[in-house]
């Protein structure tokens, strides 16, 4: 009788878990005269076999990581070895089991981070691979920090994206990391498969050494300028520097002055562009901004203070 395990020759798909010893037939194909025998071709890998009477089976455990789909063809032949029906495609999909452990690509990673870097902005990625199917929990990886050394006041300065392995600073790390106090840290990071959710998951660990570098994006000391300078303008009065080359600098006048006598070049050098008059305005406060190539601010603005010094340029009045 036709049913789940037997029937005529037609295209079919079967799903079989990898790693399981064969326990039953896959299918029994029924021959229509003059067909008397069946033949199997395709990606058999000497695992799949069809007996002359049409019994399709496999003779040893499958491995999805070797081949995830076996594309086979079955034909029905007559007594003269001539194909009467088919060949028809028979697809064997090999279902994944968790038989591979995740492995970090490196046993040790090294990276550096600037103090005061933006929280959540990745500065290093750790990466693990798992040969199991990423579309199933077996191949879904979960990263976490196991230990941070040193651990100061029980505060985590570093965080990891559980899915991508991206390491960044926490809010506390952004505020408190100081290379003068502690220039290096070590993290032990684990990766688990099964999305980290199962006690049966496999895991691996790696070590990450992190150097904390000084943040040179700092507000310069207040500048004192003599009023009514006769030197040729523009005159460089101070400078700011982003931590990496390629930043785009600009100045922001929060006071919305009718005339703003300062400029900045792409090296971060700040200039006064015309003589200042203390009697008109005795102090300026404005901001230097560093942006990336897309115009996105790289960090917080720096406050620039310019104090205008008096010269004796006004007669006394009674």
């Amino acid at each position: 009788q036709e049913g789940k395990f037997s029937g005529p020759l037609k295209p079919m798909t079967f799903s079989i878990y990898e790693g399981q010893e064969p326990s039953q037939i896959i299918f029994q194909f029924k021959a229509n005269p003059p067909a008397v025998t069946f033949e199997l071709t395709g990606e058999t890998d000497n695992i799949f076999v069809i007996e002359r009477e049409g019994l399709l089976y496999y003779n040893r455990a499958l491995d999805r990581e070797t081949r995830s789909t076996h594309n086979l063809q079955v034909a029905a032949l007559d007594a003269n070895g001539i194909i009467v029906e088919g060949p028809v495609p028979i697809t064997i999909k090999v279902k994944d089991i968790n038989d591979n452990r995740p492995t970090f690509l490196q046993s040790k990673y090294e990276g550096s981070v600037r103090q005061n870097s933006r929280p959540g902005k990745p500065f290093l990625y750790v990466n693990a691979t798992d040969l199991d199917d990423p579309a199933t929990p077996n191949g879904q990886l979960y990263y976490q920090i196991v230990i941070q050394l040193p651990m100061i006041n029980n505060v985590m300065y570093f965080q990891i994206n559980n899915k991508t392995g991206a390491i960044s600073l926490t809010r506390e790390g952004s505020q408190e990391l100081n290379p003068a106090k502690n220039p290096s840290y070590n993290l032990v990071i684990s990766v688990k498969d099964m999305g980290g959710q199962s006690e049966n998951s496999f895991s691996d660990t790696t070590s990450v050494d992190i150097i904390v570098t000084e943040n040179i994006w700092k507000a310069p000391k207040p500048v004192e300028m003599v009023e009514n300078s006769t030197d040729p303008h523009p005159i460089k009065i101070t400078q700011v520097r982003w931590n990496d080359p390629g930043a785009q600098y600009s100045l922001v006048d929060k006071e919305k002055l009718p005339r703003f006598p300062f400029s900045i070049d792409q090296e971060g050098d700040i200039y006064v562009t015309q003589p200042l008059d203390r009697e008109e305005k005795d102090a300026y406060v404005f901001y230097a901004v560093a942006k990336d190539e897309y115009g996105k601010p790289l960090s917080y603005p720096l406050e620039i203070h310019v104090k205008v010094k008096d010269i004796n340029d006004n007669p006394p009045t009674c």
Partner: antibody, heavy 120, light 107 residues
Framework: QVQLQQSGRDLVKPGASVKISCKAS????????INWVQQRPGQGLEWIGW????????YYNEKFKGKATLNVDKSSSTAYMLLSSLTSEDSAVYFC?????????????WGQGTTLTVSS | DIQMIQSPSSMFASLGDRVSLSCRAS??????LDWYQQKPGGTIKLLIY???NLNSGVPSRFSGSGSGSDYSLTISSLESEDFADYYC?????????FGAGTKLELR
């Protein structure tokens, strides 16, 4: 020696039927298939089908089903092909050929051919 | 149905020439290919079966080769009785199909 002797040329009218014969000698008739092949004027060869005299089983090219009927007379070691509802399209030389039973199924001996002309 | 394409459809050659005739199937036929010779009088003879096996009584100047869907018949040194029509036949799957033939003529 093995021989396949076919009937002589035939001239028949459209709509009629004709029976072409192929007499085998020099081997055990029931142990081999008899195949039939058509060759239209100036054309190549086209396989019509086979009959296995031992069992009487047949296999036809779908294209010739309803046109050709194969049978045998074991007592005279003769194979026959009946062609029915004839049209001018059926004008051709028809060959019988012995097919080795089992694998490989090659045609090792051929008849001399029977010329059929369908004309009013 | 499996189509069999023979090339060339006709060719001229001289006595003693080495010639190769080609037969291409529209799909793989696993070596189930035979070559037949038809003389001008109409008589047909099996030359090669299953790609490369020489039928008994056929001169050794005839040889066959090929696999998958591409096959060829080679005559190493033409003799006068070799000028004829040559057909390939696939018997991998029903219906059995012949090529359209190659006519070998004396130059």
């Amino acid at each position: 020696q093995v021989q396949l002797q076919q009937s002589g040329r035939d001239l028949v009218k459209p709509g009629a039927s004709v029976k072409i014969s192929c007499k085998a000698s020099g081997y055990t008739f029931t142990d081999y298939h008899i195949n039939w092949v058509q060759q239209r004027p100036g054309q190549g060869l086209e396989w019509i089908g086979w009959i296995f005299p031992g069992s009487g089983s047949t296999y036809y090219n779908e294209k010739f089903k309803g046109k050709a009927t194969l049978n045998v007379d074991k007592s005279s070691s003769t194979a026959y092909m009946l062609l029915s509802s004839l049209t001018s399209e059926d004008s051709a030389v028809y060959f019988c050929a012995r097919g080795k039973s089992g694998y490989p199924f090659y045609f090792d001996y051929w008849g001399q051919g029977t010329t059929l002309t369908v004309s009013s | 149905d499996i189509q069999m394409i023979q090339s060339p459809s006709s060719m001229f050659a001289s006595l003693g020439d080495r010639v190769s005739l080609s037969c291409r199937a529209s799909q793989g036929i696993r070596g189930n290919l035979d070559w037949y010779q038809q003389k001008p009088g109409g008589t047909i003879k099996l030359l090669i079966y299953s790609t490369s096996n020489l039928n008994s009584g056929v001169p050794s100047r005839f040889s066959g080769s090929g696999s998958g869907s591409d096959y060829s018949l080679t005559i190493s040194s033409l003799e006068s009785e070799d000028f004829a029509d040559y057909y390939c036949l696939q018997r991998n799957a029903y219906p059995l199909t012949f090529g359209a033939g190659t006519k070998l003529e004396l130059r």
